[in-house]
């Protein structure tokens, strides 16, 4: 008789999840010399240990601490790029602008990017059928807690001028419920971070509005100012240039000093 299995509202664990994590770890440590000391099998064991045999609605940041310790990494604290609802463009940017880093350019972010995972209480099985949805089921699920943990640490590490890329095409350019709005904004350290500079990416060159005047940007400015961090905002009208440079990163026109 097949065991009863909890049916969650979200998609199940990404197929070949263990192999994917391990392969990504090996690839990352090969490309990044400063992380060559990392033992990828230990990383996978720590990752697995965070959610296997645990109820997928009862995961804590503490569960991820062994993984966090193994994935400890130093990135230049003044070269951090946060993003909200515009991941692809942010990643394309750091692929060409090699001296800036998103969370997904770090080992832990790279391992988990675009993956879903969860286990089951009291069994060593990975659940490939369904995983908890943040809204419909529970917020303390393995994926959400992971991103909350790594995002908090990433924001805490930032210093000087921190940039955030925001999607000017969305109704809420700044969304308090996004990871950026709910975690990263509140974990920037005022004693280290001088300014948060928002880059609001316009949908196209023809859109000449000042999106830095958007009410949600004013809300972000208010939150940041109350935390004694300066805020500035720039309209960015040229996503076409981003894409051109992603296709031809070797072009000399694709170097921009911010």
């Amino acid at each position: 008789v097949p065991r009863w299995r909890q049916q969650w509202s979200g998609p199940g664990t990404t197929k070949r999840f263990p192999e994917t994590v391990l392969a990504r770890c090996v690839k990352y440590t090969e490309i990044h010399p400063e992380m060559r000391h990392v033992d990828c099998q230990s990383v996978w064991d720590a990752f697995k240990g965070a959610f296997i045999s645990k109820h997928p609605c009862n995961i804590t940041e503490e569960d991820y601490q062994p993984l966090m310790k193994l994935g400890t990494q130093t990135v230049p604290c003044n070269k951090i790029l946060l993003w909200s609802r515009i991941k692809d463009l942010a990643h394309q940017f750091t692929q060409v602008q090699r001296d800036m880093f998103t969370l997904e350019d770090t080992l832990l972010g790279y391992l988990a990017d675009d993956l879903t995972w969860c286990g089951e209480f009291n069994t060593s099985k990975i659940n490939y059928q369904s995983c908890p949805d943040w809204r419909k089921d529970c917020s303390n699920n393995p994926v959400s807690v992971f991103w909350k943990t790594v995002s908090r640490r990433f924001a805490e590490a930032a210093c000087d001028v921190v940039h955030v890329m925001l999607n000017g095409s969305r109704s809420k350019i700044f969304d308090k419920n996004s990871t950026f709005g709910s975690v990263e904004v509140h974990n920037l350290q005022p004693e280290k971070v001088q300014t948060l500079e928002a880059w609001v990416i316009h949908g196209g060159r023809e859109d000449s509005r000042d999106l830095c005047q958007d009410p949600t940007i004013k809300e972000l400015e208010s939150i940041i100012s109350k935390r004694n961090i300066q805020f500035s905002c720039k309209n960015i009208y040229r996503p076409d240039k981003f894409l051109q440079c992603v296709k031809n990163p070797e072009d000399s026109s694709c170097t921009s000093e911010i």
Partner: antibody, heavy 121, light 105 residues
């Protein structure tokens, strides 16, 4: 080193046409968006037109829309500005300028020496 | 489109500091560049992205931009700094200020 050399300017009657050229050298021409900027005698700078690196997108100031056409030939490293229905107010030195600042910001790092267009009867 | 307004002229004694303003509605929300133009010559980029200096431009040139005003500062002005200066921004189209003539007294 980067060089931009404009040619094709001259005296033309109102309603007439002129084609300006800009020969580029010292850089990979096909990697850069290019622009035309003009300056009327004793006046300030005015952006006229721009074209993307491969020529797929073109942009115009309202004052020249429908009358001027920007184009480029990457095989010849040359930028063009076809000016039709010329008016007295089009009289200016026309500069060819290379657009830099690929991601966040846009500016003109290199300029040609300019070619004078005079529209007069 | 954003409108950029510059004072027609700024007069400064040699060795003193010249400040050229470029005002526009929330200009701080846009990146600003500055160009120097001497009589009969093409413009030369002196500042881009608000405050960055291209290679070859002396350190006495600096820029800032916040609120409704961008500023080009020339510290310890020299005779060769006498020229017209233009601010420029971009909001889907390129916009130039009207230009400021810097005179060295």
């Amino acid at each position: 080193q980067v060089q931009l050399v404009e040619s094709g300017g001259g005296l033309v009657q109102p309603g007439g046409s002129l084609r300006l050229s800009c020969a580029a050298s010292g850089f990979t021409f096909s990697s850069y968006a290019m622009n035309w900027v003009r300056q009327a005698p004793g006046k300030g700078l005015e952006w006229v037109s721009g074209i993307s690196s491969w020529g797929s997108s073109t942009y115009y100031a309202d004052s020249v829309k429908g009358r001027f056409t920007i184009s480029r030939d990457n095989s010849k490293n040359t930028l063009y500005l076809q000016m039709n229905s010329l008016r007295a107010e089009d009289t200016a030195v026309y500069y060819c300028a290379r657009e830099d600042g690929s991601y966040m910001t846009d500016y003109f790092a290199y300029w040609g020496q300019g070619t004078l267009v005079t529209v007069s009867s | 489109d954003i409108e950029l307004t510059q004072p027609p002229s700024v007069s400064v004694a040699p060795g003193q500091t010249a400040r050229i303003s470029c005002s526009g509605d929330n200009i701080g929300h846009y990146y600003v560049s500055w160009y120097q133009q001497k009589p009969g010559q093409a413009p030369v980029l002196v500042i881009y992205s608000d405050s960055n200096r291209p290679s070859g431009i002396p350190e006495r040139f600096s820029g800032s931009n916040s609120g409704n005003t961008a500023t080009l500062t020339i510290s310890g002005t020299q005779a060769e700094d006498e020229a017209d200066y233009y601010c420029q921004s971009y909001n889907g189209t390129y916009v130039f200020g009207g230009g400021t003539k810097v005179e060295i007294k």
